[in-house]
């Protein structure tokens, strides 16, 4: 590339016209501030290409860099570029204007930076000061670039004198950013929503001041973009948050939402994903099974638990024999439904010191505007058995009878046993079971009655002994699921003068 005049620095008069020419073996173009100003391009007979840039009515604002470059660098060995710097001293222009990117200088490490205050005249003396400070800072100045050095987090201005007036530049703000490795967390207000409701997700990064967020989500794949909002959660260390909000969700919005965070300074990145489910309508579903018959033990506390899934949050009611239950002031009943995860619930009915009257038909109903579920079971109150009576009698028939009466829930079993050697029973000799043989020695008759009001069974059993020739220890044992009880009586022969 050949540039005329060759530069590399030119000082031109204000209001004048000046022509710059660039030529090369391939198409060439002049560039100014990353743009191509109007210019005349030509191709000579010898095959060389040229571009002529005519600068007319020059002002101080024409001060700056001009580049000549190949129009299409493909196929060329070098991406050659010629730089020319033009000054147009102009007393009406103090410092050249800066855009916002130049006024705020962000750093991530201690490094040399340039405060780009530039004047139109290379002869001017320019000094650097802290903003609102008078003392000039000892930093080298390049008229084409500005002040270069290592700067603290402060604001700075440049000063020069044009004629008899002092001119200040805009203030330049130097700020050191915090960067570190990236750790991302993603959460959603709800991971399950009904169609028409909103999806709101938050992606949070801690400890970095400069990050870019990128979300991928089902809607994006179909070209329907949603603009996330980024803000500071504003705790120390820095918490930065990006919020993705999708109003009026559709079924197609179900799927994986991924937040990718990059930090360009050190090229760190991290991403996290979360699944969102959009349902057509709400639901309530029982989890696990609860048997239709449940048990509680008299005077003990019992908690009945139902686990279910629901969205949106349901109302939960408990009923006993079709009457609504509530927490009792006496503390006999406690109801609680707790959210163990976003859509999973545990509802508990606690009966404190269970009473017989609390047996009955229980129903839990969970419902909202879209769905409902109910679960019913019978609650049986188990009562430990008690032997209420054990008596012996001598009917005229000559046989001897022993009667045992007891109660309990569930229905008690009765076991009769006897021991003939009083000295060694029951420690050394096991008692003999009675009534389960066809021997004529003994006969057994048992009757069972269910008492509705007390909700328990009564067992009455009569043991008939044919001939008792020596004292006999007879034992009645009642047993059910929650306990057992035993009583004992000594049966003596008719001929003996005593009985116990």
């Amino acid at each position: 590339l050949v540039v005329t005049p060759p530069g590399p620095e030119l000082v031109l008069n204000v209001s004048s016209t000046f022509v710059l020419t660039c030529s090369g073996s391939a198409p060439v173009v002049w560039e100014r501030m990353s743009q191509e100003p109007p210019q005349e391009m030509a191709k000579a007979q010898d095959g060389t290409f040229s571009s002529v840039l005519t600068l007319t009515n020059l002002t101080g604002l024409d001060t700056g860099e001009y580049f000549c470059t190949h129009n299409d660098s493909r196929g060329l060995e070098t991406d050659e570029r010629k730089r020319l710097y033009i000054f147009v001293p102009d007393p009406t222009v103090g410092f050249l204007p800066n855009d916002a990117e130049e006024l705020f200088i962000f750093l991530t490490e201690i490094t040399e930076i340039t405060i780009p205050c530039r004047v139109t005249d290379p002869q001017l003396v320019v000094t650097l000061h802290e903003k609102k400070g008078d003392v000039a800072l000892p930093v080298p100045y390049d008229h084409q670039r500005g002040f270069s050095g290592i700067f603290e987090d402060r604001s700075y201005i440049c000063k020069t004198t044009i004629g008899d007036r002092e001119v200040d530049s805009d203030a330049y703000y130097v700020y050191r950013l915090q960067v570190s490795s990236i750790n991302v967390s993603v959460n959603a207000v709800q991971t399950v929503v009904r169609q028409g409701e909103n999806i709101t997700l938050m992606c949070i990064v801690i400890g970095n001041e400069v990050v870019n967020f990128e979300w991928t989500y089902p809607r994006k794949e179909s070209g329907r973009l949603v603009e996330p909002v980024t803000d500071f959660l504003l705790d120390m260390p820095y918490h930065i948050r990006s919020i993705l909000h999708i109003p009026s969700a559709e079924l197609e919005d179900s799927g994986t939402y991924t937040c990718n965070v990059t930090e360009s300074v050190n090229d760190h990145q991290d991403e996290k994903a979360i699944n969102i489910t959009v349902v057509e309508s709400g639901y309530v579903r029982l989890l696990g099974e609860v048997g239709t018959l449940q048990f509680a033990e008299l005077h003990r506390s019992r908690t009945l638990q139902v686990v279910f899934e629901a969205y949106p949050p349901p109302t939960v009611l408990w009923f006993k024999d079709n009457r609504t239950l509530g927490d009792s002031s006496a503390g006999e009943i406690a109801l609680s439904t707790r959210n163990v995860s976003e859509t999973r619930y545990v509802s508990e009915l606690t009966l404190v010191r269970v009473k017989v009257a609390e047996a009955g038909h229980y129903t839990m109903r969970a419902f909202h505007e879209d769905a409902e579920v109910q679960l019913s079971f019978q609650l049986q109150i188990n009562v430990p058995v008690r032997v209420l009576e054990l008596s012996e009698s001598h009917p005229d028939s000559g046989e001897q009878t022993v009667r045992c009466r007891g109660r309990g829930m569930p229905q008690p079993n009765i076991i009769w046993s006897a021991c003939r050697d009083l000295k060694r029973c029951p420690r050394e000799l096991p008692p003999t079971l009675l009534g389960n043989s066809s021997e004529e020695e003994s006969q057994l008759e048992t009757n069972v009655t269910y008492w509705e009001e007390e909700q328990e069974f009564e067992v009455v059993s009569t043991l008939r002994l044919q001939h008792v020739d020596r004292p006999l220890s007879v034992r009645c044992t009642l047993r059910n699921a929650v306990g057992q009880d035993t009583q004992e009586v000594i049966v003596v022969p008719h001929s003996l003068p005593f009985k116990v």
Epitope: P97, N98, D99, A100, E101, L103, F104, F106, D168, D170, A171, Y173, Y175, L177, E209, V210, V211, N212, F213, V229, T230, D231, F232, L233, L234, D235, M236, Y238, H239, I240, S242, E263, S264
Partner: antibody, heavy 127, light 107 residues
């Protein structure tokens, strides 16, 4: 040298309109966010609105949304506040201020305060 | 909107005193807080930005501290020129809110 001068204030009836102007000098106006802040005499400061360098982003306090509009003309180094549907509670001194909001760093803005203020212009809404 | 609460509303002090003004945000604002000084009939003047950074030209007797929700402006030795009203101001997601102000007057 760096200066902001407000104008356009005055007495207006409730429901009326007014247009405030702010003339900037001594700095590259087109490189800065700008804000309007108001102050009821004897009371505290209330931020009203702000806008970015090219006017593509504008933000307002809730109480003025839909009634007050911020705008700018960079070639004229001027900031404006169009006030419609004025109410008695809009009576205040209105200040124009330079808002130090750097270009986005990553996905968000930094903030270094309002470093240059005008002297204010009084708006009185009364019948 | 984020609310800013300053205390006290009025503070009486003498030249040479150490003066402390506090500002509390209704939610965390990191260190996005500025302090301003205003004298009667004048426009506010920026003193401190980003909670603790002193604006150029502001005397070093002014200092700011705090982050999250609780912030403090301290004047280490009150001077005659410092009798004024002081305001804190937060920045969060493009909006700004000022505190109600603290008037520092002569005891």
């Amino acid at each position: 040298q760096v200066q902001l001068v407000e104008s356009g204030g005055g007495l207006v009836q409730p429901g009326g309109s007014l247009r405030l102007s702010c003339a900037a000098s001594g700095f590259t106006f087109s490189s800065y966010w700008m804000s309007w802040v108001r102050q009821v005499p004897g009371k505290g400061l209330e931020w009203v609105a702000n806008m970015n360098q090219d006017g593509t982003e504008k933000y307002y306090v809730d109480s003025v949304k839909g009634r007050l509009t911020i705008s700018r003309e960079n070639v004229k180094n001027s900031l404006y506040l169009q006030m419609n549907g004025l109410r008695a509670e809009d009576t205040a001194v209105y200040y124009c201020a330079r808002d130090l909001v750097p270009p986005r760093q990553g996905d968000y803005y930094y903030y270094f305060g309002m470093d240059v203020w005008g002297h204010g212009t009084m708006v009185t809404v009364s019948s | 909107a984020i609310q800013m609460t300053q205390s006290p509303s009025t503070l009486s002090a003498s030249v040479g005193d150490i003066v402390t003004i506090t500002c509390r945000a209704s939610q965390s604002i990191s260190d996005w807080l500025a302090w301003y000084q205003q004298k009667p009939g004048k426009a506010p003047k920026l003193l401190i930005f980003k909670a603790s950074s002193l604006e150029s030209g502001v005397p070093s007797r002014f200092s700011g501290s705090g982050s999250g929700t609780d912030f403090t402006l301290t004047i280490s030795s009150l001077q005659p020129d410092d009798f004024a009203t002081y305001y804190c101001q937060q920045y969060n997601s493009y909006s700004r809110t000022f505190g109600q102000g603290t008037k520092v007057d002569i005891k």
